[in-house]
């Protein structure tokens, strides 16, 4: 009996035309939503003039339907048993699941001012930037609509730069009509224990963002894992959103719509400093902001963002060191709301429910030559927004899963 089930599972989780796995893999049958909470800055003037703590108030959720588009350019390679594809990006606003509209206004850090002052460290260049910032009436903070902040707006300061630069700025710009990849993953035909594991991303086995093992593309994309998952396993996966591979460990047994699943969570150790977790030494890319690699809970992904000083963390700086959140007032981290988890059906390795949570932050530093940053007395890692991307297997699919998979085993 067990061998027959194993044989059937092995057959059905292969990523090729005709299998259950392939059908759901090409176009997810699960509705995936991405909720955003924006950190609205309450005291922009005090921060700019007196280098006060930044008082933030989160506003949300603003919800978008995502991952509804089928994978594109799906190409099987029989020679190395891989399948390559592009994952198209798309987002549709869901007013009924949101607290307001895409036209809602927020006071946030001026992304262009913070980024330009970081990228161009030369003092003379900063003086040129300063005159353009002043001319465009830009400041350290700006008021932007949700749509602008997420999907892009023409920045008045960058528009004055007299040589070619991208003048459109947005946290997720460009997004619609773009695609992530190319991914090339093992289809599992020759070795089911490799199914869905990424072979290459954008044609490479490494990212070129990090040193040593930190630069490796490990595991799957977290949508599924090779079958017969054990509780003792450490599940590796790659997330292009955070420009790195990361891992999850077993936390508890969960019953999801009558299906027994394993809840795997991202442990705090994954976000620890190299002092606590020596494996993380290569995620520490500079010594000043990281206080000689003793700070933790924030990841500098500037190398992956054309030099823009983007830092990724968990929402509300969950699992981050006190020095990171100290200059920010209004944050309340809690594990239940702010950690990332994956609910995995262990026989198939399919992720039937997940909550991926992350926060986008931008570093802003004092600048002697940029007037609007002149009065700052310290560096700030400024939270801009946090997101919660969730997906849960639908009732119909759950019934099918119970009858065809878990029901047969029990």
């Amino acid at each position: 009996g067990d061998l027959l089930i194993q044989k059937t599972i092995k057959k059905q989780v292969v990523l090729e035309e005709g299998t259950i796995a392939f059908k759901n893999w090409v176009k997810t049958g699960t509705e995936v939503y991405r909720q955003f909470w924006i950190f609205d800055v309450q005291n922009p003037q005090e921060v700019m003039m007196n280098s006060s703590n930044i008082q933030v108030k989160q506003r949300g959720p603003y919800t978008y339907r995502v991952r509804f588009l089928a994978k594109e350019n799906v190409t099987q390679d029989a020679e190395d048993n891989t399948v390559s594809f592009l994952q198209p990006n798309g987002a549709i606003f869901e007013p009924s699941l949101s607290v307001g509209t895409e036209a809602d206004n927020f006071t946030v850090l001026n992304l262009a001012v913070a980024a330009a002052s970081h990228i161009y460290q030369n003092q003379f260049v900063q003086m040129i930037l300063n005159s353009l910032i002043n001319k465009s009436k830009s400041s350290m903070f700006q008021v932007r609509t949700l749509r602008e902040l997420l999907w892009g707006y023409r920045d008045p300061f960058l528009s004055l730069v007299p040589y070619p630069v991208t003048t459109t700025v947005g946290l997720f710009y460009p997004y619609n009509n773009t695609a992530d990849g190319v991914y090339k993953v093992f289809n599992g035909k020759d070795n089911i224990s490799k199914v869905a594991i990424i072979d290459t991303y954008k044609g490479k086995r490494n990212l070129s963002y990090w040193e040593s093992h930190c630069d490796m593309i490990n595991g799957t994309d977290a949508a599924s894992f090779p079958p017969f998952v054990e509780k003792s396993q450490v599940l590796q996966f790659f997330s292009s959103d955070i420009c790195r591979s990361i891992y999850a460990v077993f936390e508890s047994d969960v019953n999801l719509k009558g299906i027994p699943v394993y809840r795997f969570v991202l442990p705090s150790k994954a976000f620890a400093s190299p002092v606590e977790n020596p494996d993380n030494y290569c995620f520490c890319t500079e010594k000043i902001i990281s206080k000689n690699c003793t700070s933790y809970g924030v990841l500098d992904i500037s190398k992956c963002k054309e030099g823009r000083p983007v830092y990724i963390s968990l929402p509300h700086f969950l699992y981050a060191s006190p020095d990171v959140s100290e200059p920010i007032d209004g944050l309340n981290p809690n594990e239940e709301e702010h950690r990332t988890y994956l609910d995995i059906e262990p026989i198939t390795g399919f992720t039937l429910q997940f909550a991926k949570r992350l926060q986008v932050n931008l570093l802003v530093k004092p600048s002697e030559k940029i007037q609007v940053l002149k009065n700052l007395k310290r560096n700030y890692i400024v939270p801009i927004l946090w997101l919660n991307e969730t997906g849960t297997i639908g009732d119909e699919k759950a019934n099918m899963f119970r009858s065809q998979v878990t029901g047969k085993i029990n």
Epitope: Y120, N122, Q123, F124, V125, M127, I128, N130, S131, P162, Y163, E368, K369, Q371
Partner: antibody, heavy 115, light 107 residues
């Protein structure tokens, strides 16, 4: 040792253009911006503009905007200042000088504008 | 634009004297003031850069002070070789602006 060597003296007719070169040595050219300063006979110093060879960032004094063009050739570590529509009041010694604090200076290039 | 008013335009001193030159700016420039010496037929020479930093090789009799809008350049125990023009330059904002210069004559 840091050296800035400028091109030789020029005599120009009103309405014409002049291009002064400044060859840098003794340091990595793209590490520092190059500024240009002029001094009319018996007068004080006047900043004209500056260029950062690394980014191509340029700033000009309002007075010279539209008449002066600064360029930098990283391959030869040379900065250039071109001044067009010359008039007699442009007769001056033109200096290239390094960085925001003008720490090293070229020997100067005398440009005489005369009909 | 930050205007820089330098005074006096001319001064005369005897070796051993102490002289001071003043530069006042129309806007707050923190400590971004530089001081130069220029002798006839030569390019200017940087003596003191931002933050009253004496350049290597410049004698310690030269000093400066000031912050914001008021700046002072001092030569203690003047020597005959100090006869020259002296200029201040603000490097806080664009356009960079010089003072009008001070001619120092040694009697």
């Amino acid at each position: 040792e840091v050296q800035l060597v400028q091109s030789g003296a020029e005599v120009k007719k009103p309405g014409s253009s002049v291009k002064v070169s400044c060859k840098a040595s003794g340091y990595r050219f793209s590490d520092y911006e190059m500024q240009w300063v002029r001094q009319a006979p018996g007068q004080g110093l006047e900043w004209m503009g500056g260029i950062d060879p690394e980014t191509g960032g340029i700033a000009y004094a309002q007075k010279f905007q539209g008449r002066v063009t600064l360029t930098a050739d990283k391959s030869t570590s040379t900065a250039y200042m071109e001044l067009s529509s010359l008039r007699s009041e442009d007769t001056a010694v033109y200096y290239c000088t390094r960085k925001l604090d003008f720490d090293y200076w070229g020997q100067g290039t005398l440009v005489t504008v005369s009909s | 634009e930050t205007t820089v008013t330098q005074s006096p335009a001319f001064m005369s001193a005897t070796p051993g004297d102490k002289v001071t030159i003043s530069c006042i700016t129309s806007t707050d420039i923190d400590d971004d003031m530089n001081w130069y010496q220029q002798k006839p037929g030569e390019p200017p020479k940087l003596l003191i850069s931002e933050g009253s930093t004496l350049r290597p090789g410049v004698p310690s009799r030269f000093s400066s002070s000031g912050y914001g809008t008021d700046f002072t350049f001092t030569i203690n125990n003047i020597e005959s070789e100090d006869a020259a023009y002296y200029y201040c330059l603000q490097s806080d904002n664009l356009p960079l602006t010089f003072g009008q210069g001070t001619k120092l004559e040694i009697k």
